[in-house]
């Protein structure tokens, strides 16, 4: 059990296009055909204006027109829904396919891809039907852009909704050595296949991936709950042979100053195949990106029944230490370390702003707005609203709500 860990199956609430909790001022576009097809008319099931957002330019062949939604704070976006133009039921414009781009800071933009690297999402077949796209993997984003596509010069229009939940963990990025391949009777690929940051040689930095997607791995790391994926998919793993230091070092960056109670690490312990829980964990803390580490590291030795081969969540107490950046070293206790998920139990430090001190130049509009003093249940489970049910089978299936 991962205490304090979000459940992706429950993170499927409408984020406020249709019910207007996302204000018009947070919806923008690269261009609009007219004021009556401006970005603010892009709300799912709305008939405002001429019934949708329609870009001024052609989306063929350039695919440069976009509709942007600013969620103001980091959210996990698990699904998106699209519709064509309403126009009193007379609209004929819709988008058969589209791409998504997202950003956590308004500076770096990532293209959403499914687990097999496919970027293009199937859209609508008519103007009125709602097509939901289950995003596998989900994206952690503040800003989301929809780029409609067409295979010829034609008019396309769009209405949208985003579904998910507030990203309460506040994790902006983790830095880790690139996951490796274990060779058994078949190759087991223990790379972080959904990582959305930079990968330069042996290091991944500036992004999030499978260690923060809410999916915990099975006892047998060769198997997965996901369909049509390769052996080892749920885990990121490192071989002791590659680390002369005897540990894997990771860094975690958060949206703002937090008091950390604990870190939860979901680990594999299939020791007959070389996977072992870490022998211990050591974490250091700092408040700013260019600052020195503060105080003594927190050290936690892991005893327990190493003979039990089941995967499990290991809880590492962090003593309420205040930081925005953590560096943790996970000590090898066997040939391999395999993690499927890392999450944190923390509280936002009151009055903390993400732009700590003046230690770095500000981004154009970084940071997101200050958090509320306490989280209401409304933010996590909107009142009177049910999460969108997950389709059986493939997590990336499209289904219609006509």
């Amino acid at each position: 059990d991962m205490k304090g860990h979000f459940d992706p199956a429950k993170c499927r609430y409408a984020l406020g296009m249709q019910d207007r909790t996302i204000p018009d001022s947070d919806i923008s576009a690269s261009s609009s055909w007219s004021d009556s097809t401006a970005a603010r008319h892009s709300r799912l099931e709305s008939s405002d204006g001429d019934g949708a957002w329609c870009p001024a330019g052609s989306v063929f062949p350039k695919e440069e027109e976009y509709l942007q939604v600013d969620l103001q704070r980091l959210h996990l976006v698990a699904l998106v829904g699209t519709q064509g133009r309403h126009a009193g039921g007379l609209g004929k414009e819709f988008s058969r396919s589209y791409r998504l781009r997202y950003s956590r800071d308004g500076r770096r933009w990532m293209g959403w891809k499914d687990r097999w690297g496919q970027e293009v999402i199937s859209g609508n077949e008519d103007p009125e039907g709602v097509v939901l796209k289950d995003l596998g993997p989900p994206m952690v984003a503040r800003l989301v852009r929809f780029y409609p596509r067409a295979d010829r010069v034609m008019s396309v229009c769009l209405r949208v909704e985003l579904y998910g939940c507030l990203w309460r963990d506040g994790l902006l990025s983790y830095t880790a050595p690139v996951g490796q391949t274990m060779y058994l009777s078949e190759a087991v690929y223990l790379n972080d296949s959904t990582y959305d940051g930079h990968t330069v040689g042996g290091l991944q930095y500036g992004g999030l991936g499978q260690l923060a997607d809410g999916v915990v791995g099975l006892d047998d790391f060769r198997k997965s709950q996901e369909l049509r994926v390769w052996p080892g998919y749920d885990y990121v793993g490192w071989s002791n042979h590659s680390f002369s230091s005897g540990y894997v070092e990771m860094e975690f960056e958060f949206d703002r100053l937090r008091a950390f109670q604990a870190m939860q690490v979901h680990c594999n312990n299939m020791h007959t195949l070389g996977a072992r829980l870490p022998g211990g964990v050591e974490c250091r803390f700092r408040r700013g990106p260019a600052m020195a580490w503060e105080g003594e590291p927190m050290r936690h030795n892991l005893g327990g029944n190493l003979g039990d081969p089941r995967a499990r969540a290991v809880s590492v107490p962090l003593g309420g230490r205040v930081a925005r950046f953590l560096q943790c070293r996970f000590l090898f206790a066997g040939p391999w370390l395999l993690f499927s998920e890392i999450s944190f139990i923390s509280d936002v430090v009151n009055n903390s702003s993400p732009a700590l001190g003046g230690t770095f130049p500000p981004a154009p509009w970084w940071p997101p707005g200050p958090p509320p003093t306490n989280f209401s249940s409304l933010e996590l489970e909107p009142r009177g609203q049910q999460p969108v049910a997950k389709a059986e089978g493939s997590p990336t299936i499209e289904f219609r709500m006509d």
Epitope: P177, H198, T199, G202, G206, S245, E251, E253, P289, Q327
Partner: antibody, heavy 121, light 107 residues
Framework: QVQLKQSGPGLVQPSQSLSITCTVS????????IHWVRQSPGKGLEWLGV???????DYNAAFISRLSISMDSSKGQVFFKMNSLQANDTAIYYC???????????????WGQGTSVTVSS | SIVMTQTPKFLLVSAGDRVTITCKAS??????VAWYQQKPGQSPKLLIY???NRYTGVPDRFTGSGYGTDFTFTINTVQAEDLAVYFC?????????FGAGTKLELK
């Protein structure tokens, strides 16, 4: 303030090795990588390699057999060593820093002053 | 490795001109592109990061745009102190690669 200061020889004999030290100040190594880039009239700017704060290195495949980058974080120093230099390795060699954190991420925002290296007998 | 094809190699300009430099990546690099200015005898200086974000203290006459494979760098009203060589660079993946540079010279 942030500074990267380079020290190393200006003249290297063919087949000999080149050693340059990049001493950093005004920031902690943690959360940064120190990159090495060279510039020659014939080949423009060429990325050679990087060392990250955890000691992980990455080298341009074209130089991997003769390049080594290491660090002494307690002294704020990064060491660059390239073996078997030839005349076409004549260039200006730079160190530059690059953040690994989202919040301080600005590409290669600070560069050393450069070390002009001539390979000649 | 990713090739960054930068054009043109040279630009003859007068003060007040609007200048555009393009960089084309041999494969998609998202928006992981930076632009640098280098004056004779100096180290490169960061102007634009993530394709369109101006670095601290960089005048707003310098702008960048693009995503994927096509990137543009513009100086809206060239001033005498802008005469330099400009480079694009991708840091999407290893090995990091640079464009060949564009030299701005006075007409």
């Amino acid at each position: 303030q942030v500074q990267l200061k380079q020290s190393g020889p200006g003249l290297v004999q063919p087949s000999q090795s080149l050693s340059i030290t990049c001493t950093v100040s005004g920031f902690s190594f943690t959360g940064y990588g120190i990159h090495w880039v060279r510039q020659s009239p014939g080949k423009g700017l060429e990325w050679l390699g990087v060392i990250w704060s955890g000691g992980i290195t990455d080298y341009n495949a074209a130089f991997i057999s003769r390049l080594s980058i290491s660090m002494d974080s307690s002294k704020g120093q990064v060491f660059f060593k390239m073996n078997s230099l030839q005349a076409n390795d004549t260039a200006i060699y730079y160190c530059a820093r690059r953040s690994t954190t989202v919040v301080a991420d600005y590409a290669m925002d600070y560069w050393g002053q450069g070390t002009s290296v001539t390979v000649s007998s | 490795s990713i090739v960054m094809t930068q054009t043109p190699k040279f630009l003859l300009v007068s003060a007040g001109d609007r200048v555009t430099i393009t960089c084309k990546a041999s494969q998609s690099v998202s928006n992981d592109v930076a632009w640098y200015q280098q004056k004779p005898g100096q180290s490169p200086k960061l102007l634009i990061y993530y394709a369109s974000n101006r670095y601290t203290g960089v005048p707003d006459r310098f702008t960048g745009s693009g995503y994927g494979t096509d990137f543009t760098f513009t100086i809206n009203t060239v001033q005498a102190e802008d005469l330099a060589v400009y480079f694009c660079q991708q840091d999407y993946t290893s090995p990091l690669t640079f464009g060949a540079g564009t030299k701005l010279e006075l007409k």
